[in-house]
Interface confidence: low
């Protein structure tokens, strides 16, 4: 049913879904702080532009008795329940921030006619791709897939002279929400990644993974997994690893690799870590003081969601355009806005673009070093370290198939 929006006459409201099931186990209080900090900035920016309007947020909490697992896998109905709550209260803002769970977002699109913009810190799955009124402020699975295919095909760098066409994917079902959907996308029989690879096998058991590390009959030298170094250590321990094995560890939302005093443990020497380029002003901000490095991106996405709304509101008000229109709902894409930590670019489908960073462990310094960066906006790789001090022979990445290339 159509719900009237609190979104006119100089008063503009943001509906923030505070869901028990969330992509990251972040206390809702921290998300509230992020939203409130964003509101302060938006009010200041609008005032500076000579726009004398009110911007507020309404936090909508779901019934903790029903939705209390905290697990995205059981989140399917929670978003719909919250929408019903909004509908019953006749209290919908100009924009909806949340949910972050892929199942929840997907279901809300299936079961509702969304005529207002929806901003998500999450919704990583491919099933949330190409949604006309959805904006995603954390890197979705599609962006990861495009990096991997680009990197696999690259064969003209001093440290990577072979195209790869094979991979193992380790996926045991206990992953965090982001990893779950990243790996789902890689596993999917119909996806860009699967389509571009000649061989791909999913390893589901710890023992399968452990056996591959020294299996002379393995079909690929490359293993993709998702999580932090501790997750890898729990799985791999100090087991011997064949010298031409390359583990790609996807750990996008983790700034710890860039901290000054971090030393790479020995078990990381066969590993390339894929993460996001870290922000620079977050460490001292009031909202992020209590956040771990992994949680910072989640709270930041909420904050940037508020700033994105402020950006669009400013544009529409300056142009004298109505906010409660399909044009506004569809406008949150193909743009760059001033985020909390610098410019944020959204692609044609409203998904955040970012700089991904591939790190290696220097055998000399035992530090993580940047091997290359990848700009998701232009799907292009930029080498950084032309003569890396790799553990692999000749300081080159091996071929992906044993017996073809440096062993």
């Amino acid at each position: 049913s159509q719900v009237s929006q609190n979104c006119h006459n100089g008063s503009y409201e943001i509906s923030v879904l505070m869901m028990g099931n969330s992509a990251f186990a972040e206390p809702l209080k921290n998300l509230e702080d992020a939203v409130n900090e964003g509101l302060e900035i938006v009010r200041g920016r609008l005032q500076n532009a000579g726009l004398n309007v009110t911007v507020n947020a309404t936090f909508m909490y779901s019934d903790g008795l029903i939705h209390n697992s905290g697990d995205c896998r059981s989140s399917t109905c929670e978003g719909l329940d919250l929408l019903r709550k909004i509908s019953n209260a006749q209290r919908m803002g100009c924009v909806l921030i949340g949910p972050s769970c892929t199942y929840s977002t997907f279901q809300m699109y299936l079961d509702t006619e969304l005529s207002y913009p929806m901003i998500s810190a999450g919704s990583f799955g491919l099933s949330c791709d190409y949604k006309e009124t959805l904006t995603r402020l954390m890197s979705p699975a599609r962006k990861l897939m495009y990096f991997l295919v680009n990197f696999w095909k690259t064969n003209d760098l001093p440290f990577k002279t072979y195209s790869w066409s094979t991979s193992y994917v380790y996926k045991n079902g206990t992953e965090t929400e982001d990893c779950f959907w990243y790996l789902n996308a890689l596993e999917a029989s119909v996806s860009y990644f699967s389509h571009e690879l000649g061989f791909k096998v999913v390893l589901r058991q710890d023992k399968e993974f452990q056996d591959i590390l020294m299996d002379h009959n393995r079909k690929s030298n490359v293993i993709i997994m998702c999580g932090g170094p501790e997750f890898l250590y729990k799985l791999k321990g100090d087991r011997a690893v064949a010298e031409d094995i390359v583990i790609i560890l996807v750990d996008l939302f983790n700034d710890q690799y860039f901290e000054d005093n971090v030393t790479a443990p020995d078990y990381m020497k066969n590993v390339l870590v894929l993460t996001l380029s870290p922000g620079n002003s977050l460490l001292n901000s009031s909202f992020s003081r209590n956040l771990s490095p992994t949680k910072r991106d989640f709270a930041l996405a909420y904050l940037n969601g508020i700033l994105l709304f402020g950006h669009m509101l400013k544009i529409f008000l300056e142009n004298g355009e109505n906010i409660t229109t399909p044009k506004f709902a569809h406008a949150f894409r193909n743009l760059t806005f001033e985020g909390y930590d610098g410019p944020v670019t959204l692609d044609d489908w409203g998904d955040v673009d970012s700089t991904m960073v591939l790190l290696y462990t220097s055998v000399d310094t035992k530090k993580y070093k940047v091997l290359l960066t990848y700009d998701t906006h232009v799907n292009k790789t930029y080498p950084v370290d032309m003569s890396p001090t790799f553990t692999w022979k000749n300081s080159k990445l091996p071929n992906d198939i044993t017996g073809r290339g440096p062993q």
Partner: nanobody, 119 residues
């Protein structure tokens, strides 16, 4: 979950053309990836083609690239497979499938439509 029904199969000579259709129930059609698979007698099911909800992403199996074209009309809740330059080895039961793009497998399958390529 959507329900899907295929049509358009039949007997065609080598080098000929055929157009398969797949109609899906429900107004949420554009939220689903759709795909075509085929199974010849005594063989494993083979991926033919797939298309994302918006039509923005399209994939083809190696054996049909350049000959088959997948498309969809979200206003009509219908997906199509235009098959040109058909070969005897294209003979199979063709299945339409639907599912959220990125799920490891499609979760809704049709009953199939028989395509026979023979002179």
């Amino acid at each position: 979950e959507v329900q899907v029904v295929e049509s358009g199969g039949g007997l065609v000579q080598p080098g000929g053309s055929l157009r398969l259709s797949c109609v899906a129930s429900g107004r949420t059609f554009s939220s689903y990836a759709m795909g075509w698979f085929r199974q010849a007698p005594g063989k494993e099911r083979e991926f033919v083609a797939a298309i994302s909800g918006s039509g923005g992403s399209i994939y083809y199996g190696d054996s049909v690239k350049g000959r088959f074209t997948i498309s969809r009309d979200n206003a009509k809740n219908t997906m199509y497979l235009q098959m040109n330059r058909l070969k005897p080895e294209d003979t199979a039961v063709y299945y339409c499938a639907a599912g959220p793009l990125g799920s490891p497998d499609f979760d809704s399958w049709g009953q199939g439509t028989q395509v026979t390529v023979s002179s």
